[in-house]
Interface confidence: medium
Amino acid sequence: AMHVAQPAVVLANSRGTASFVCEYASPGKATEVRVTVLRQADSQVTEVCAATYMMGNELTFLDDSICTGTSSGNQVNLTIQGLRAMDTGLYICKVELMYPPPYYMGIGNGTQIYVIDPEPCPDSD
């Protein structure tokens, strides 16, 4: 399996945005790569977002996706927005080299994203 590296822990900012780098050791000459972010919480795994991109081009997520990203070589810079405290969990980066053959797939160990809801501002008279 292809090796995928990602940071162990990331803290979302006060606006509920978290960014991390997902890096893969490409054993092939991929022209087309698919990146999927999975969230694992309470032994449940759900897909957060996914994008297929051509090497050297931008990642394109669906319009309503909470993810954005850029790619540079074998690195993908992922940003997840709109996070709240309840979204705290392990976010796993899955990378697939879709084309040309051979197909390779790798899954990272996951990035624990901590989200702290901001304290409501006290009313000021």
């Epitope: 022209t31 040309p100 053959p101 197909y103």
Partner: antibody
Framework: EVQLLESGGGLVQPGGSLRLSCAAS????????MNWVRQAPGKGLEWVSA????????YYADSVKGRFTISRDNSKNTLYLQMNSLRAEDTAVYYC?????????????WGQGTLVTVSS | QSVLTQPPSASGTPGQRVTISCTGS?????????VHWYQQLPGTAPKLLIY???QRPSGVPDRFSGSKSGTSASLAISGLRSEDEADYYC???????????FGGGTKLTVLG
């Protein structure tokens, strides 16, 4: 059940054009890369062209580069091969074939083929 | 001239074991790409017989087996039967040509 049905073959004069279609069913078309493979009468198999599932990556055999164009319409589950500047040596049965993604790729499923004859 | 080299013909009598070889190069089989085998019965489309060097799709009898070593691969058919009479092709991806390459095909004749 996976089904691939080629159409568009026929007799064409040298220098002419033809567009082949391959209608796919029984699988999620956009998830699979597709290929055209041809077989001249009494000869072996020759890979012609390939296109990735998204349509973003295309590859061609040197013998057809610059003359043939592979494309796909994922909304119609259809693969195409636009053949221009046809030559007598392009005469063959043209098969569309589906790649299989599972640790490696291979040409897992084939259509029954459509015959292209280039002759004056 | 095919990129992968196969013998043009092979033959055997019913019950015998026959082997068909497929020789490639450092840009295809030798580069680590898997070898796949196809059977083409007269007048029909090719059918996947062996994938990833030695794997059989469901429905293919275990009389058919494949192996790969270095830049070569082989297909073995044991307990030969008359219905095995067909053309057999090997295939692999080639990373210098960026495409699939095939052997020239081996015509198998079942004698008697």
């Amino acid at each position: 059940e996976v089904q691939l049905l080629e159409s568009g073959g026929g007799l064409v004069q040298p220098g002419g054009s033809l567009r082949l279609s391959c209608a796919a069913s029984g699988f999620t078309f956009s998830s699979y890369s597709m290929n055209w493979v041809r077989q001249a009468p009494g000869k072996g198999l020759e890979w012609v062209s390939a296109i990735s599932g998204s349509g973003g990556s295309t590859y061609y055999a040197d013998s057809v580069k610059g003359r043939f164009t592979i494309s796909r319409d994922n909304s119609k589950n259809t693969l195409y091969l636009q053949m221009n500047s046809l030559r007598a040596e392009d005469t063959a049965v043209y098969y569309c074939a589906r790649d299989r993604v599972e640790m490696n790729q291979w040409l897992a499923d084939w259509g029954q083929g459509t015959l292209v004859t280039v002759s004056s | 001239q095919s990129v992968l080299t196969q013998p043009p013909s092979a033959s055997g009598t019913p019950g015998q074991r026959v082997t068909i070889s497929c020789t490639g190069s450092s840009s295809n089989i030798g580069a680590g790409y898997d070898v796949h085998w196809y059977q083409q019965l007269p007048g029909t489309a090719p059918k996947l017989l062996i994938y990833r060097n030695n794997q059989r799709p469901s429905g293919v009898p275990d009389r058919f087996s494949g192996s790969k070593s270095g830049t070569s691969a082989s297909l073995a058919i044991s307990g030969l039967r008359s219905e095995d009479e067909a053309d057999y092709y090997c295939a692999a991806w080639d990373d210098s040509l960026n495409g699939w390459v095939f052997g020239g095909g081996t015509k198998l004749t079942v004698l008697g």
